[in-house]
């Protein structure tokens, strides 16, 4: 059943669900700061456009009575609980800044008819793809699978002359929320990644991963994993690695690679890091002083969620259109708006597009260097370093299957 | 976090969750009638034992604000919502008569630390197995898999001389809640059934099922499905069926086979029906006049849940033991109590044991006849009709794989 909305003439509210369970362990006050900073910008933009309206946020907190709080694994019902709370309090805004946890978001769409727009800083899983009123402002798993397939197939670059069609995936179940769903998408037999590969095996134990590094009978030279360099080191340590092994370390929301004076440790030499180009505008922001490089992206997604709300409000108000209609609920997609850090593009399904960056460790300088970028909007790889100083033979990425001659 | 309990000296309450989403489409007033009838019996039994205490039920209704109500597929969070409602109202009883929907029950255990006993008339899925404070009063999927494996392996009966190790499973996603989880358990690669079979294939389309009936290249002669004869007829119609096909129709909660003057339709001749021996004591009960043969079992489970609560109350009070302890919460298992219809046995994990009955259609009388019974408590098959008048050749069940000679 529907909830009445605080979305009247001249007064527009965004309901922000402040969940005990979150995709990133971010203090709720930081999220609140990001939202408030976003509101200030939106108010300015609306005033600048001659729209004299009031814009506010209502923060809806969990009561903590029931849920095991903490990570997203026990978050399934928390979003619905808050929706009930909003419903009882008659405090639904024009838009819901919803859960970041995939389970929670999925459940809200499963159990209710959501006829108002929901913006999420997370909801990474494939089960949240193609939701007609959902907008996701951090790269969802589908975008990762498209990059990987594109990269696997690429065979016309100076440093990658082989198409790949095989992979190991390391997934031990202790991953962060983003990694959990990224790896789930790679594991899922129905996913694009699985569909396009001729061989894929999930390694679940540390020992399986460690054994593959020097196993002459391995079925692939490529291992995809997700986490930061420290996570890899705990697993790999200083073990010897066969020369044609390539580890792809997915670490999208981590700006540390771009910080000054960062040197790549020796254990990263066989590793390509997939990340995103950093947003540096938050560095001096009032609410971001205490943010880690990872959390910066999460806070930025909340801030951009508010700016998106403002953008849509401005568009509809300027066109004299009603905000509480299905048209508004379905409009948060297939557009570009001005985010805090520059233009933000949403695809046809409301998912953020971004520039992914593949880094390698230069054997000369021990620095992370950009090998290529990938624009998720056009599904296109753009080589950057045509003569990388790789650890791999001839400074080229090896084939994914080693030719061992007659056996 | 924990909820205070209405479970004091001399006054004991059972909290009954009255869900919009239910395993069987049963009007809530019928459930309430069953509970109230059970309470009358419990009060009598306690008074008879010289225990002058008050026993009541508090019925907790969903507010219907959020959930898509109806079947169990959108029930995940409803149990938790009611638990929150109980928590806010400070109305938790000694025991929770909980959700019948698997999703809902599973979620309650996933998201909370349930330290009080929960009784369910349903929660059929494997994901609700082995919950330390959960009691299930309708046969869960695990029990079905144990019967099927036992029956497949049996090869020393006059009418079954072959061990089977293959099966098709028909599962099109429109099944009732009990069937949905029974078939899920057969499909699951980790289940006992899958583990013990050398070949198993799930048929998801009507046409796949229909084609198998006469397919010379089929990999198994045995098809397991779940539903009533009408469901089978819609699927199979009057199509010809190869003579060595055996359809196992799981229809546990349906007493119609045992009613007087029931004749088996012709399309049931290749079918073995797995059901349970009927509880006829409900037929004249005040609350069961309007119950269908299926719903009788559901109402009976609620009634028996109340009787189990009474049994445990009596046991602990007579022993001078505290009711609001972990010991009480973990005690609803590995016992036999007097149900409405006779003794009810719970296994080590709190799941009801029953006598399953395998019926065949007599080609002579066109009546359903008992072929064998299976006691889930001891995992034992007991043949009943040693000379069944089967449709199958030599009145014996065929091998599961037809020997086609040299190909």
């Amino acid at each position: 059943s529907q909830v009445s909305q605080n979305c009247h003439n001249g007064s527009y509210e965004i309901s922000v669900l402040m969940m005990d369970n979150s995709a990133f362990a971010e203090p709720l006050e930081n999220v609140e700061d990001a939202v408030n900073e976003g509101l200030e910008i939106v108010r300015g933009r609306l005033q600048n456009a001659g729209l004299n309206v009031t814009v506010n946020a209502s923060f809806m907190y969990s009561d903590g009575l029931i849920h095991n709080s903490g990570d997203c694994r026990s978050s399934t019902c928390e979003g619905l609980d808050l929706l009930r709370k909003i419903s009882n309090a008659k405090r639904m805004g024009c838009v819901l800044m919803g859960p970041s946890c995939t389970y929670s978001t999925f459940q809200m769409y499963l159990d209710t008819e959501l006829s108002y727009p929901m913006i999420s800083a997370g909801s990474f899983g494939l089960s949240c793809d193609y939701k007609e009123t959902l907008t996701r402002l951090m790269s969802p798993a589908r975008k990762l699978t498209y990059f990987l397939v594109n990269f696997w197939k690429t065979n016309d670059l100076p440093f990658k002359t082989y198409s790949w069609s095989t992979s190991y995936v390391y997934k031990n179940g202790t991953e962060s929320e983003d990694c959990f769903w990224y790896l789930n998408a790679l594991e899922a037999s129905v996913s694009y990644f699985s569909h396009e590969l001729s061989f894929k095996l999930v390694l679940r134990q540390d020992k399986e991963f460690q054994d593959i590094l020097m196993d002459h009978n391995r079925k692939s030279n490529v291992i995809v994993m997700c986490g930061d360099p420290q996570f890899l080191y705990k697993l790999k340590g200083d073990r010897a690695v066969a020369e044609d092994i390539v580890i792809i370390l997915v670490d999208l929301f981590n700006d540390q690679y771009f910080e000054d004076n960062v040197t790549a440790p020796d254990y990263m030499k066989n590793v390509l890091v997939l990340t995103q180009s950093p947003g540096n505008s938050l560095l001096n922001s009032s609410f971001s002083r205490n943010l880690s490089p990872t959390k910066r992206d999460f806070a930025l997604a909340y801030l951009n969620g508010i700016l998106l709300f403002g953008h849509m409000l401005k568009t509809f108000l300027e066109n004299g259109e009603n905000i509480t209609t299905p048209k508004f609920a379905h409009a948060f997609r297939n557009l570009t708006f001005e985010g805090y850090d520059g233009p933000v593009t949403l695809d046809d399904w409301g998912d953020v597009d971004s520039t992914m960056v593949l880094l390698y460790t230069s054997v000369d300088t021990k620095k992370y260097k950009v090998l290529l970028t990938y624009d998720t909007h056009v599904n296109q790889t753009n080589p950057v370093d045509m003569s990388p100083t790789f650890t791999w033979k001839n400074s080229k990425l090896p084939n994914d299957i080693t030719d061992r001659g007659p056996q | 976090s924990q909820v205070s309990q209405n479970c004091h000296n001399g006054s004991y309450e059972i909290s009954v969750l009255m869900m919009d989403n239910s395993a069987f489409a049963e009007p809530l007033e019928n459930v309430e009638d069953a509970v109230n009838e059970g309470l009358e019996i419990v009060r009598g039994r306690l008074q008879n034992a010289g225990l002058n205490v008050t026993v009541n039920a508090s019925f907790m209704y969903s507010d219907g604000l959020i959930h898509n109500s109806g079947d169990c597929r959108s029930s995940t969070c409803e149990g938790l919502d009611l638990l929150r409602k109980i928590s806010n109202a400070k109305r938790m009883g000694c025991v929770l008569m909980g959700p019948s929907c698997t999703y809902s029950t599973f979620q309650m255990y996933l998201d909370t630390e349930l330290s009080y006993p929960m009784i369910s008339a349903g929660s059929f899925g494997l994901s609700c197995d082995y919950k330390e404070t959960l009691t299930r009063l309708m046969s869960p999927a695990r029990k079905l898999t144990y019967f099927l494996v036992n029956f497949w392996k049996t090869n020393d009966l006059p009418f079954k001389t072959y061990s089977w190790s293959t099966s098709y499973v028909y599962k099109n996603g429109t099944e009732s809640e009990d069937c949905f989880w029974y078939l899920n358990a057969l499909e699951a690669s980790v289940s006992y059934f899958s583990h013990e079979l050398s070949f198993k294939l799930v048929l998801r389309q009507d046409k796949e099922f229909q084609d198998i009936l006469m397919d010379h290249n089929r990999k198994s002669n045995v098809i397991v499905m779940c539903g009533d004869p009408q469901f089978l007829y819609k699927l199979k119609g009057d199509r010809a069926v190869a003579e060595d096909i055996v359809i196992i129709l799981v229809d546990l909660f349906n007493d119609q086979y045992f009613e007087d003057n029931v004749t088996a339709p012709d399309y049931m001749k290749n079918v073995l029906v797995l059901t349970q021996s009927p509880g006829n004591s409900l037929l004249n009960s005040s609350f069961s006049r309007n119950l269908s043969p299926t719903k009788r079992d559901f109402a009976l489970a609620y009634l028996n849940g109340i009787l189990l609560f009474g049994h445990m109350l009596k046991t602990f009070l007579e022993n001078g033991e505290n009711i609001t302890t972990p010991k009480f919460a973990h005690a609803f298992r590995n016992l036999t109590f007097e149900g409405y219809d006779g003794p009810v046995t719970l296994d080590d994990w709190g799941d009801v044991d029953s006598t399953m009955v395998l019926l065949y259609t007599s080609v002579d009388t066109k009546k359903y006849k008992v072929l064998l019974t299976y006691d889930t408590h001891v995992n034992q098959t007991n043949p009943v009709d040693m000379s069944p008048t089967f449709t199958w050749k030599n009145s014996k069940l065929p091998n599961d794989i037809t020997d086609r000679g040299p190909q």
């Epitope: 910008i41 933009r45 600048n48 456009a49 001659g50 729209l51 300027e318 001005e338 520059g342 | -």
Partner: antibody, heavy 119, light 107 residues
Framework: QVQLQQWGAGLLKPSETLSLTCAVF????????WSWIRQPPGKGLEWIGE???????NDNPSLKSRVTISVDTSKNQFALKLSSVTAADTAVYYC?????????????WGQGTLVTVSS | EIVMTQSPATLSVSPGERATLSCRAS??????LAWYQQKPGQAPRLLIY???TRATGIPARFSGSGSGTEFTLTIGSLQSEDFAVYYC?????????FGQGTNVEIK
């Protein structure tokens, strides 16, 4: 108080490349778009294009193929290059700051640089 | 692009009188319109944004109105320092475009 200070060559020959730089003092650089606007002698204002601290640009299509706007955040500076100039490009060139990020109107202006294109 | 047309090209007004300047857009710009004042040899100065909101430090005698395609800048009582060229500018879309200007001169 925010101040914009601009400099660059004032006299160019046709076909040369105009090059101007604008430095920002006394305010945040990252929260704004920074524009170039020109005004031919005795005429009205023409917006050339804009850039933010990340290098995202929007240009006037009438000039686009000739315009390059760049940014150096380490120095809080942005620059304009206009290639293949002709006498029609003679104007006072202003750098300006939007009143707020993407606001599209300009509350702080440089002092202006007269660029003359003459053979 | 959106073409901005100002009228009149020149407006002669006596000090202390009211001046009314018009600006028309070739298509709707909602209220995304700004007004600037420019004196000889100086950079333009922002007066009004959002069609009617005065920028910081702008006297109350300056007021803006209108929406869509028709806009007006009114100077309530002209002071000697108000004689200048006034430009309207739309910022609804890119490219940002200015009107050709109205020169307010002493009558």
């Amino acid at each position: 108080q925010v101040q914009l200070q601009q400099w660059g060559a004032g006299l160019l020959k046709p076909s040369e490349t105009l090059s101007l730089t604008c430095a920002v003092f006394g305010g945040s650089f990252s929260g704004y778009y920074w524009s170039w606007i020109r005004q031919p002698p005795g005429k009205g204002l023409e917006w050339i294009g804009e850039i933010n601290h990340r290098g995202n640009t929007n240009d006037n299509p009438s000039l686009k193929s000739r315009v390059t706007i760049s940014v150096d955040t380490s120095k809080n500076q942005f620059a304009l290059k206009l290639s293949s100039v002709t006498a029609a490009d003679t104007a006072v060139y202003y750098c300006a700051r939007e009143r707020g990020y993407t606001y599209g109107n300009f509350d702080h202006w440089g002092q202006g640089t007269l660029v003359t294109v003459s053979s | 692009e959106i073409v901005m047309t100002q009228s009149p090209a020149t407006l002669s007004v006596s000090p202390g009188e009211r001046a009314t300047l018009s600006c028309r857009a070739s298509q709707s710009v909602s209220r995304n319109l700004a007004w600037y004042q420019q004196k000889p040899g100086q950079a333009p100065r922002l007066l009004i944004y959002g069609a009617s909101t005065r920028a910081t430090g702008i006297p109350a005698r300056f007021s803006g109105s209108g929406s869509g395609t028709e806009f007006t800048l009114t100077i309530g009582s002209l002071q000697s320092e108000d004689f200048a060229v006034y430009y309207c500018q739309q910022y609804k879309t890119w490219p940002r475009t200015f009107g050709q200007g109205t020169n307010v001169e002493i009558k």
